[in-house]
Amino acid sequence: EVEKTACPSGKKAREIDESLIFYKKWELEACVDAALLATQMDRVNAIPFTYEQLDVLKHKLDELYPQGYPESVIQHLGYLFLKMSPEDIRKWNVTSLETLKALLEVNKGHEMSPQVATLIDRFVKGRGQLDKDTLDTLTAFYPGYLCSLSPEELSSVPPSSIWAVRPQDLDTCDPRQLDVLYPKARLAFQNMNGSEYFVKIQSFLGGAPTEDLKALSQQNVSMDLATFMKLRTDAVLPLTVAEVQKLLGPHVEGLKAEERHRPVRDWILRQRQDDLDTLGLGLQGGIPNGYLVLDLSMQEALS
């Protein structure tokens, strides 16, 4: 708390301007009226206040708005936003995308802070769903945003928003997240033709089931190895050698370099060595000829 001291004669602020940067902490507290500050918030960000001075201004706004700031103040917070705690932000009702953008701009170039995470959470909850414009904005500032959401949160993303997602936005997503996003992407891109569809769906394929991979293998898609390595192991295992060959096209040669890594390693173990040999890549570890393969998982399910 800043001590309450009388404002020195002639120092009472008539407006928020540059002269205030020369005010000491106690002078700002005593000489700047909170209501004046609130009505001239748009000027604050144009004045080179120090963090100490911003703390005083925040204190004044907190006293004026104990239940939380109105959006007219929030949209002009600028660097003052960096002084807000998640508890402060939970009191806000932010509805305008422009306000969200203005506040994200202040934190630009930095990882997502607890304040930003709280702000985004409040904004998205207020909207009820993660619409395309919001997703566009959030991924522009934080490419990893989508992958920071839980599968439950991702379930509120409408398929139409998937158009805003760029491949790099999915870089850090795990299989559970892609399991939720893939069906939405499939729905969003369903009216596209073969090659265009594959370009769009490619980065979501870590959530694709076996039957969809089989279908893609019939479409000459030439999937690259990086994409193949991100596929779900359980979705790759049932694919035949012929299907994988069709799926990868000319990239099939890359299997040799990845034969010790999942899902390639596990897939090799499930294939007949004869079939693997037809690829001419020297892949080893398949089922020797003449061996009978029992599907134990099927047997367990029956018992």
């Epitope: 540059e18 940067i21 902490k25 144009a46 004045i47 080179p48 206040f49 120090t50 963090y51 100490e52 001075q53 911003l54 703390d55 660097y79 960096l82 002084k83």
Partner: antibody, heavy 123, light 107 residues
């Protein structure tokens, strides 16, 4: 790339004054804050003050108040620091340093520094 | 003005060592703290800001932590090029002030 290029070394008599220049990148010249920091031989860093050309603001550390003046020439993207009534203890390397970003902010730490100008005050 | 103190004022260490330098402010500075490295005859080089954020291009062996009045700079595994003088700086209020420096020497 941000560059701050300072004028060359100076030898001055006690009681005289010195003017050090700091030429900055054109793109962010007026919007950024240029700070002046000095370092006496074998000593630490001492902040002298800052200038924000776009706002015509100069903020001087109390120890230098009345002896130091910062000016800016937008036509050449150059900031100047003039120190008067020189004494032997003003012998130091004088640095200009710029804050991050493309406009002023409260983040007054300094990713960009000039190479330094040695000012020697000796009779 | 906020006074900054650093400890130790000098320290000897070997390549590969883990080193910690402490900086204390005379009042709370809300993480408004930067760390610099300076080599003889050169301008200071920014290492970290906001107490713990690494400046781009700075090796990840440098890290910072702290809050309120007490802050630390840690070098996880000293490299030959790390022997230099280190300064902390508060930018919470004017006048912005620096610590007196910590000289890191080869043992």
């Amino acid at each position: 790339q941000v560059q701050l290029v300072q004028s060359g070394a100076e030898v001055k008599k006690p009681g005289s004054s010195v003017k050090v220049s700091c030429k900055t990148s054109a793109d962010t010249f007026s919007a950024n804050t240029i700070n002046w920091v000095r370092q006496a031989p074998g000593h630490g860093l001492e902040w002298m003050g800052r200038i924000i050309p776009s706002l015509n603001i100069r903020d001087y550390a109390q120890e230098f108040q009345g002896r130091v003046t910062f000016t800016a020439d937008e036509s050449t993207n150059t900031v100047y620091m003039q120190l008067t009534s020189l004494r032997s203890e003003d012998t130091a390397v004088y640095y200009c340093a710029r804050d991050p970003g493309s406009t002023w902010s409260p983040n007054q730490f300094f990713p960009h520094w000039g190479q330094g100008t040695l000012v020697t005050v000796s009779s | 003005a906020i006074r900054m103190t650093q400890s130790p004022s000098s320290l000897s260490a070997s390549v590969g060592d883990r080193v910690t330098i402490t900086c204390r402010a005379s009042q709370g500075i809300s993480n408004s703290l930067a760390w610099y490295q300076q080599k003889p005859g050169k301008a200071p080089k920014l290492l970290l800001y906001a107490a713990s954020r690494l400046e781009s291009g700075v090796p990840s062996r440098f890290s910072g932590s702290g809050s309120g009045t007490d802050y630390t700079l840690t070098i996880s595994s000293l490299q030959p090029e790390d022997f230099a003088t280190y300064y902390c700086q508060q930018y919470y209020s004017t006048p912005f002030t620096f610590g007196p420096g910590t000289k890191l020497e080869i043992k």
